[in-house]
């Protein structure tokens, strides 16, 4: 007996698609061996049509694929645009076609349903609207108009022109009699249910001279579109339900046990906790279509998703719906990176963001997820030299280390920086990742003075004290600007006296600005790194003023202004820019959204997504090599 299992019979109609799942014991050998789908010939033999090693027969070109799910012990063969020629006996199997590790599948493709005599066939999707047209002759113009549904042997009245409506159709049916010029009445049924399917008879008049017309209503449950995405990647569900529901609440739900479809997100403000920080529902278009983006895909996100429209914001019978079956591939091309990064108030974090290494020239972005309403993600910084105004001097996006990873450094952390951030590019939309920043108690490791004032034409020396734990790290000073942080020469002044219980390995490294000019004003960072991987940073603002007294200035820690955690940028005096991430390709419909709200105002609560990949110690963020 073969251990392979699958459907013995598959019946479909021309033009349809099939999705055939074959099950195998998920041993390590089976998981990685060749998977195939072949057609059995009359004289034995089995001709391969598609295999997991990339082969696709010319018969299947452009209309079939085979996807292996090693973690489930299944592979799926999708075949589209079926024709009757596809009918036959097939095998799905592992290894070599002739080896016997296979399962026999009979595929039968029949002709689509033909028209019955004098019967108009209406094929409509579940939840949508159908208009059944019923012609009549002049002699029946003033007579009763009615629509019956054939239930078994008996016609049951559905609606008539005297005002009767069958209780099963209350609130979703109407009978329209056209103007006198047209000998036609119409019955419009909204929010179609599967139970509405069947044979209908419309009639004008009740005697032997009545006009009758047969109608066959077929209500289609939407076939789920199969979506395959990588673990840790991103998926976008595009939901187009039609203009008739443009003003009705929209939802995306995930089918769980039973008939339940648990709301993932809806336009009434509901969002499932498991998707906090990693979901956006874009504003809907006038035609009622909308998109939902989910990032940071997890194994447990796999399943059947429905989007729909209903005033309750959740699935009800008669909701127009679209369906997807999401598979999450655990053999992901997207590297592991921490889903939670912790930083000490007053200190910094360095976040590593993966991107598709084939798209090294793409523009990189970092945005802050906001849960209000349907979720949005205003941009904070990009790789083209744009930084949101209130992040000047404390946020930088670096192309390093490159080759599939970029780095975002955020310093001068306060509790308001806690939240979810997205890494993305204007290239491959599947490579959107989410990281949660948590602010923890503790002291910054690097010690620098507070804001410093330099005098024009004089020399300024700014100290940065590095504890001994950073003895093996490269220490640097740099001047921040919108495009990054340009390295500056610095001097090692020997061991620092700023740390208790710290041996000779602590270091005081100074930045010296000779003959200060106005151009020297701005933000300076001192920090540590190992190669291209960045660690903790500390920021100092240097102001430049006219000469008051001669001599150079040497700034000590004692002259520091406010503690870093108390320092809040006053953004009230300048216009606040806001690029909102409605693209790059996040929502292609709206490239940028102007928003004059100050994102620095109002605290953001941190939401713990229960990540098992937390990363502790703000000084260790650069250790995660890919």
């Amino acid at each position: 007996k073969s251990p392979i299992f699958g459907p013995e019979e598959v019946n479909s109609v021309e033009g349809n698609s099939v999705s055939i799942t074959c099950y195998y014991p998920p041993t390590s050998v089976n998981r990685h061996t060749r998977k195939y789908w072949c057609r059995q010939g009359a004289r034995g033999g089995c001709i391969t049509l598609i295999s997991s090693e990339g082969y696709v027969s010319s018969k299947y070109a452009g209309r079939a694929n085979l996807t292996n799910f090693p973690e489930n012990g299944t592979f799926v063969v999708n075949i589209a645009q079926l024709s009757q020629d596809d009918s036959g006996r097939y095998k799905c199997g592992l290894g070599i076609n002739s080896r016997g590790l296979s399962f026999d599948v009979s595929l039968e493709v029949s002709q689509g349903p033909g028209l019955l005599n004098d019967t108009k066939v209406y094929t409509v999707d579940l939840g949508r609207t159908v208009t059944i047209n019923c012609p009549f002759k002049t002699e029946n113009a003033q007579k009763r108009k009615s629509l019956y549904k054939q239930i078994g042997l008996y016609p049951v009245l559905v609606i008539d022109s005297s005002g009767y409506v069958n209780p099963n159709y209350t609130g979703r049916i109407r009978l329209d009699i056209q103007g006198t010029g047209q000998l036609l009445f119409s019955v419009v049924i909204n929010q179609l249910r599967l139970s509405d399917a069947g044979q209908y008879l419309c009639q004008a008049g009740d005697d032997s001279n009545s006009n009758k017309k047969n109608a066959d209503l077929q209500v289609l449950k939407p076939e789920p579109e199969l979506v395959y995405e990588d673990l840790r990647g991103s998926v976008t569900f595009h939901c187009a339900l039609g203009p008739e529901v443009a003003n009705v609440a929209k939802f995306l739900c995930r089918q769980s046990s039973g008939e339940n479809c648990d709301v993932v997100v809806n336009t009434l403000g509901k969002r499932a906790p498991a998707f906090e920080g990693r979901i956006l529902l874009n504003p809907q278009d006038k035609d009622g279509s909308f998109s939902v983006v989910i990032t940071g895909l997890r194994k447990e996100d796999a399943g059947r998703y429905l989007c729909g429209a209903h005033s309750d914001g959740q699935l009800q019978e008669g909701s127009p719906i679209q369906a997807w079956q999401l598979f999450v591939n655990e053999e992901s091309t997207i590297p592991r990176s921490p889903t939670v990064v912790k930083g000490v108030a007053g200190s910094s974090v360095a976040v590593l963001c993966p991107y598709n290494r084939k798209e090294s020239k793409s523009i990189k972005y970092w945005c802050l997820w906001e849960g209000a309403q349907n979720g949005r993600c205003p941009l904070l910084v990009d790789s083209e030299g744009w930084v949101k105004a209130q992040y000047e001097g404390r946020l930088s996006l670096l192309e390093e280390p490159g080759n599939g990873t970029f780095t975002v450094i955020l310093n001068q952390l306060t509790s308001r920086d806690a939240g979810f951030y997205w890494c993305l590019t204007n290239g491959d939309t599947l490579w959107r990742t989410t990281v949660e920043i948590k602010i923890i108690e503790g002291e910054p490791n690097l010690k620098v003075p507070g804001n410093v004032t330099a005098v024009l034409g004089e020399t300024l020396k700014v100290p940065c004290h590095f504890p001994c734990k950073f003895s093996s790290y490269e220490k640097y000073w740099c001047k921040w600007n919108n495009t990054g942080c340009q390295a500056l020469p610095s001097q090692d002044e020997g061991p620092s006296k700023a740390f208790v219980n710290c041996d000779e390995n602590s270091r005081l490294v100074s930045l010296t600005l000779n003959l200060v000019t106005r151009a020297d004003e701005g933000w300076y960072w001192c920090g540590v790194k190992q190669g291209h991987f960045y660690g903790e940073t500390a920021a100092v603002y240097v102001a430049v003023e006219e000469r008051k007294a001669a001599g150079s200035r040497d700034v000590s820690l004692a002259k520091a202004d406010a503690a870093p955690d108390e320092k809040v940028l006053d953004s009230g005096f300048r216009e606040i820019e806001n690029k909102a991430i409605q693209d790059p390709r996040l929502f292609a419909e709206e490239k940028a959204v102007a928003d004059t709200r100050d994102q620095a105002d109002g605290s953001r609560a941190s939401v713990d997504s229960g990540s098992s990949e937390e990363q502790g110690g703000s000084s260790r963020h650069h250790h995660h090599h890919h």
Epitope: F5, P7, E8, E9, V10, N11, S12, V13, N16, S17, V18, S19, I20, Y23, N72, T74, L126, R193, L194, L220, K221, P222, E223, P224, Q255, S256, S257, G258, E259, N260, C261, G303, R304, L315, E317
Partner: nanobody
Framework: QVQLVESGGGLVQAGDSLRLSCAAS????????MGWFRQAPGKEREFVTT??????????YYADSVKGRFTISRDNAKNTVYLQMNSLKPDDTAVYYC?????????????????WGQGTQVTVSS
């Protein structure tokens, strides 16, 4: 909720045929697959056959022990699934349960099914 009601069980001779029906009612618009399991006294519940559907495509799965003898079918309009059992054997004696699922990852696994009927007894005498 979805309610399932089985009928058609009974006592037959070996070699005879029997047709079981399973009528579904309630919120059947969310169901995706329906099937039959059976349980003989003192034994585990075992998979017999399942039919799943997507639009106008049907997929039929059978256990090795019933292949070629049992046939599953459905009547969409009546929300009913049928199990035609031919060439019955004494080994087929069991309580036959109808089951329905909204999301079916592996049709052979009972825990994948969300709704169950009360069962109908099939006895095959030699």
């Amino acid at each position: 909720q979805v309610q399932l009601v089985e009928s058609g069980g009974g006592l037959v001779q070996a070699g005879d045929s029997l047709r079981l029906s399973c009528a579904a009612s309630g919120r059947t618009f969310t169901t995706y697959g329906m099937g039959w399991f059976r349980q003989a006294p003192g034994k585990e519940r075992e998979f017999v056959t399942t039919i799943t559907w997507s639009g106008s495509t049907n997929y039929k799965y059978y256990a090795d022990s019933v292949k070629g003898r049992f046939t599953i079918s459905r009547d969409n309009a009546k929300n009913t699934v049928y199990l035609q059992m031919n060439s019955l054997k004494p080994d087929d004696t069991a309580v036959y349960y109808c089951a329905a699922s909204t999301v079916l990852r592996d049709p052979r696994v009972p825990t994948e099914y969300d709704y169950w009927g009360q069962g109908t007894q099939v006895t095959v005498s030699s």
